[in-house]
């Protein structure tokens, strides 16, 4: 369910009206701080036992327009010798994010919120052995 | 060639004004479809060689108000015997997402876009051995 932010400032706000049409400032506010962002390593994609590649997904009618999506490089994981281990699977970790999609032909621009499932990276899991009946 | 979806611009739209104050419909449109969402495995966090836990992060002045954040269970990775491997590190895969933060005391509600760095899951990487000078 969509949660309506708590506020004492707007008594008797009709939830359906509130959700339908809110004003948003799309200038991104960087709450992370430069240090936090710069500490985030981007080399895990090569060093992981389940390495991945990043693919550029651009949609000019979406906010954010550019999203980089992960895809696992191999079906299996890479062992200490650099070989593929057939007992271990490389699997995609996905996250559901919210994006804004521009309403077609809207001038001035209006947006709606959409859910999007994006691959973020890969992890290594033991293969599940299916027992024969 | 990968085609970027087409968009019709608004002639004479002042881009800086456009970003400053847009209308958004916060009723979430599920572009994923129920099947996609329900097929997404959620047991990787336990089965991974770099397992993680999920922690609930709630902010009533944020949209979405609830975000689940990953934290790695161990500093090291778990080997085939279920023991911690001191040559392998369990590291957090983070993703930068955009959230809407309600402007304080705004009536009717207005929001600004904020960046947030969230942990999504963990992956296993070889420890980097620092050479002594």
């Amino acid at each position: 369910a969509a949660i309506i932010p708590q506020s004492s400032a707007c008594p008797n706000t009709e939830a359906k009206d509130f959700l339908q049409n809110v004003k948003v400032n799309l200038k991104v506010f960087n709450s992370l701080g430069a240090k936090v962002s710069s500490r985030r390593p981007s080399d895990y994609l090569n060093r992981s036992t389940s390495p991945w590649t990043l693919h550029r997904n651009e949609d000019p009618d979406r906010y954010p327009s550019v999203i980089w999506e992960a895809q696992c490089r191999h079906q299996r994981c890479v062992n200490a010798e650099g070989k593929l281990d057939h007992h271990m699977n490389s699997v995609l970790i996905q996250q559901e994010i919210l994006v804004l999609k521009r309403e077609p032909e809207s001038c001035p621009f209006t947006f709606r919120v959409e859910k999007m499932l994006v691959g973020v990276g890969c992890t290594c899991v033991a293969s599940i052995v299916r027992q024969a009946a | 060639a990968a085609i970027i979806p087409q968009s019709s611009a608004c002639p004479n739209t002042e881009a800086k004004d456009f970003l400053q104050n847009v209308k958004v419909n916060l009723k979430v449109f599920n572009s994923l479809g129920a099947k996609v969402s329900s097929r997404r495995p959620s047991d990787y966090l336990n089965r991974s060689t770099s397992p993680w836990t999920l922690h609930r992060n709630e902010d009533p002045d944020r949209y979405p108000s609830v975000i689940w954040e990953a934290q790695c269970r161990h500093q090291r990775c778990v080997n085939a015997e279920g023991k911690l491997d001191h040559h392998m590190n369990s590291v957090l895969i983070q993703q930068e997402i955009l959230v809407l933060k309600r402007e304080p005391e705004s009536c009717p509600f207005t929001f600004r876009v904020e960046k947030m760095l969230v942990g999504v899951g963990c992956t296993c990487v070889a420890s980097i051995v620092r050479q002594a000078a």
């Epitope: 994609l45 000019p60 954010p64 327009s65 550019v66 980089w68 | 979806p5 087409q6 968009s7």
Partner: antibody, heavy 121, light 106 residues
């Protein structure tokens, strides 16, 4: 003030590699991708590829795939373009330019001053 | 690859003239971008998203078009407008540029 400051001119031998830097200032480095474009003497503009400093993602014009390597160092807000196996046709001015990740409407808005790479035996 | 063909390749005009440069794409594209470049200088974003004038660009410039045909128009040419103009598309990979239109003083 937004600035993209590139490294100085280079003269290289055929078969060697060159690494050009592009130091960004005046904005949040990770909010923008860095694209690289080159211009041979008296010629038009040619897109090489893109690097996303935030995620580390790269995407190349197939013409340069395997020879160009785009990287970025978030701690110094610097992007790099390395081109290997240089040949005389790679003699050009190389430009870095930024591209807003959130709203691509703006396109490539600020450009570096360019780095001249001359490949000659 | 999407080819962008600019016409004319070069153009001699006088101060005060109305000038139109066209850019024709080999396939339909969403937006066109225009860059101005002067000798020995970096390209400057001039018109973005087909219609929008970049900061500092005089209002005598305008952009229009859709699909495969786009134009840059200067309503009354000024001395500082003499330069090379490139169109650019980012609707399909690889991103491409037109061959350029060199605007010279008659």
């Amino acid at each position: 003030e937004v600035q993209l400051v590139q490294s100085g001119a280079e003269v290289k031998k055929p078969g060697s590699s060159v690494k050009v830097s592009c130091k960004a200032s005046g904005y949040t480095f990770t909010d923008y991708e860095i694209h690289w474009v080159r211009q041979a003497p008296g010629q038009g503009l040619e897109w090489i590829g893109v690097n996303d400093p935030e995620s580390g993602g790269t995407f190349y014009n197939q013409k340069f795939d395997g020879r160009a390597t785009l990287t970025a160092d978030k701690s110094t807000s610097t992007a790099y373009m390395e081109l290997s196996s240089l040949r005389s046709e790679d003699t050009a001015v190389y430009y870095c330019t930024r591209y807003y990740r959130y709203e691509s409407f703006y396109g490539m808005d600020y450009w570096g001053q360019g780095t001249t790479v001359t490949v000659s035996s | 690859d999407i080819q962008l063909t600019q016409s004319p390749s070069s153009l001699s005009a006088s101060v005060g003239d109305r000038v139109t440069i066209t850019c024709s794409a080999s396939s339909s594209i969403s937006y066109i971008y225009w860059f101005q470049q002067k000798p020995g200088k970096s390209p400057k974003r001039w018109i973005y998203a087909t219609f929008e004038l970049a900061s500092g660009v005089p209002s005598r410039f305008s952009g229009s078009g859709s699909g495969t045909d786009y134009t840059l128009t200067i309503s009354s040419l000024q001395p500082e407008d003499f330069a090379t103009y490139y169109c650019h598309q980012r609707s399909s990979y690889p991103w491409t540029f037109g061959q350029g239109t060199k605007l010279e003083i008659k």
